[in-house]
Interface confidence: low
Amino acid sequence: VKMAETCPIFYDVFFAVANGNELLLDLSLTKVNATEPERTAMKKIQDCYVENGLISRVLDGLVMTTISSSKDCMGEAVQNTVEDLKLNTLGR
Amino acid sequence: EICPAVKRDVDLFLTGTPDEYVEQVAQYKALPVVLENARILKNCVDAKMTEEDKENALSVLDKIYTSPLC
């Protein structure tokens, strides 16, 4: 949950690609004003997930979740939260 | 803001070699089945995407990272 808060649009696009849902991918890419060539490129990546099946999608989703919830990322998230708290305190 | 480790993973998926990408994945999930899957996906992307496609995908990532939704 915390990871998606850090950059929700990234996880929207990633899970749309890995899920193999073209409509969902189009909707996500519209949010960042992706051009037609950019959409084509992202669909080629999506094709790889579709071709390799459900297990492949689950495994890669697991990798992304593991990286996003690793100490490398969580340490960063905690640091950012501390910085935000400092800024909020200073702003009062 | 996106976590640098995630950014690196995605960058290597597009612009790294299969070895570099798999080594990066192994730092987080060293299961043989996961690493084999990572290599298969990486090889598939390398086979399907031209250099221009990869530039376009990187451009999408730039738009994502600079989006207000990130």
Partner: antibody
Framework: EVQLVESGGGLVKPGGSLRLSCAAS????????MNWIRQAPGKGLEWVSY????????YYADSVKGRFTISRDNAKNSLFLQMSSLRAEDTAVYYC??????????????WGQGTLVTVSS | EIVMTQSPDFQSVTPKEKVTITCRAS??????LHWYQQKPDQSPKLLIK???QSFSGVPSRFSGSGSGTDFTLTINSLEAEDAATYYC????????FGQGTKVEIK
């Protein structure tokens, strides 16, 4: 200019040991995967071993597994190949080679000039 | 282990002729395929990396194509200096060379 210079080759008896070195210059050594590749006299190229940039990932061809050890010293821009239990079929020119990267067409695979290892009694 | 099968083993060609060398991988290797040229008593020189990327300084008559399992090296209008042995190398999973193709000038 990228340069790779191998040394340490020579004549050795079967069962003996030898340590090859490769001195790298002209690029950021610690950024690249490095390989040892060999070529027996009059034969084709055979990949021997590679080591990742950090040294975390190491792989060997089945023909040398358990007998050869690859290592690197990033501080000294050096690559090594420790060879033991040498056999006549290990006789070859040994090349040190730098891997390329996908996204920069100037960063190709570079090779040294090679060092000859002869295993004979 | 990925096996690389190169063909033909030998080719005798007249100058200005077009040369085609193929390399087949036993399983998909994406675009992780490189082509080398080796002349007698010299170390191999990279011609094409990642299936189709020309390496800097390599004459434009050398080109590469293919992805997945089938790859081709093409030498358009062969020159005398192109007499050499050509090898393909896969770097998708470990490293494997093809057995080589010797190109001789008639």
């Amino acid at each position: 200019e990228v340069q790779l210079v191998e040394s340490g080759g020579g004549l050795v008896k079967p069962g003996g040991s030898l340590r090859l070195s490769c001195a790298a210059s002209g690029f950021t050594f610690s950024d690249y995967y490095m390989n040892w590749i060999r070529q027996a006299p009059g034969k084709g190229l055979e990949w021997v071993s590679y080591i990742s940039s950090s040294g975390n990932s190491i792989y060997y061809a089945d023909s040398v597994k358990g007998r050869f050890t690859i290592s690197r010293d990033n501080a000294k821009n050096s690559l090594f190949l420790q060879m033991s239990s040498l056999r006549a079929e290990d006789t070859a020119v040994y090349y040190c080679a730098r891997d390329g990267r996908y996204n920069d067409r100037r960063r190709g695979y570079y090779w040294g000039q090679g060092t000859l290892v002869t295993v004979s009694s | 282990e990925i096996v690389m099968t190169q063909s033909p083993d030998f080719q005798s060609v007249t100058p200005k002729e077009k040369v085609t060398i193929t390399c087949r991988a036993s399983q998909s290797i994406g675009s992780s395929l490189h082509w080398y040229q080796q002349k007698p008593d010299q170390s191999p020189k990279l011609l094409i990396k990642y299936a189709s990327q020309s390496f800097s300084g390599v004459p434009s008559r050398f080109s590469g194509s293919g992805s997945g399992t089938d790859f081709t090296l093409t030498i358009n209008s062969l020159e005398a200096e192109d007499a050499a042995t050509y090898y393909c190398l896969q770097s998708s999973s470990l490293r494997t060379f093809g057995q080589g193709t010797k190109v001789e000038i008639k």
